[in-house]
């Protein structure tokens, strides 16, 4: 497994998909740390397999962004601020 230190903190970085020389597009990228806390009693009662510790993951997403038109004539998001927020997991 990669070392946690290998993953930079959640911050604005150049978006390699849409940036042009002299015209960078920024994207929120990096790692957010998960929070662990004792599972509340009322939550425990609803669990099929009870867990004493609950971990809460967050993901690096845009807190704010502008929509800009880039070369190729399409709109992209140019992120202006980042934060660690609820992860939305992809369901197949």
């Amino acid at each position: 497994a990669p070392d946690v230190q290998d993953c930079p903190e959640c911050t604005l970085q150049e978006n390699p998909f849409f940036s042009q020389p002299g015209a960078p597009i920024l994207q929120c990228m990096g790692c957010c740390f998960s929070r662990a806390y004792p599972t509340p009693l009322r939550s425990k009662k609803t669990m099929l397999v009870q867990k004493n510790v609950t971990s809460e993951s967050t993901c690096c997403v845009a807190k704010s962004y502008n929509r800009v038109t880039v070369m190729g004539g399409f709109k992209v998001e140019n992120h202006t601020a980042c934060h660690c927020s609820t992860c939305y997991y992809h369901k197949s």
Epitope: P16, F17, F18, S19, Q20, V70, M71, G72, F74
Partner: nanobody, 117 residues
Framework: QVQLQESGGGLVQAGGSLRLSCAAS????????MGWFRQAPGKERESVAA????????YYASSVRGRFTISRDNAKKTVYLQMNSLKPEDTAVYTC??????????WGQGTQVTVSS
């Protein structure tokens, strides 16, 4: 340039799923970034999702994050867009694109996705 052909569009009810495919042919260097774009009637084309050559890096528009998943199979020269929890506002013509270094110079013809409420 790369030739791109999309498939998988159609009519689906809100909350449903579709999987779009984009097959590449021609000068298909594996270093190409691939992406999905969409254009709704009366609106500008917008980026939806993009993926780099080795699938190590992806991009999603905020409006589709957590609902759409982009993936690629370099052996099949195909990129996919799995679209779940579709909403009426996802209705658009979805076009596949290929590019390098921030320049998107190859486009498919597009496939219509209609989400009814």
């Amino acid at each position: 340039q790369v030739q791109l052909q999309e498939s998988g569009g159609g009519l689906v009810q809100a909350g449903g799923s579709l999987r779009l495919s984009c097959a590449a042919s021609g000068r298909t260097g594996s270093t190409y970034d691939m992406g999905w774009f969409r254009q709704a009637p009366g609106k500008e084309r917008e980026s939806v999702a993009a993926i780099n050559w080795d699938s190590a890096r992806t991009y999603y528009a905020s409006s589709v994050r957590g609902r759409f998943t982009i993936s690629r199979d370099n052996a099949k020269k195909t990129v996919y867009l799995q679209m779940n929890s579709l909403k009426p506002e996802d209705t658009a013509v979805y076009t596949c694109g290929a590019g390098e270094g921030g320049t998107w110079d190859s486009w498919g013809q597009g496939t219509q996705v209609t989400v009814s409420s």
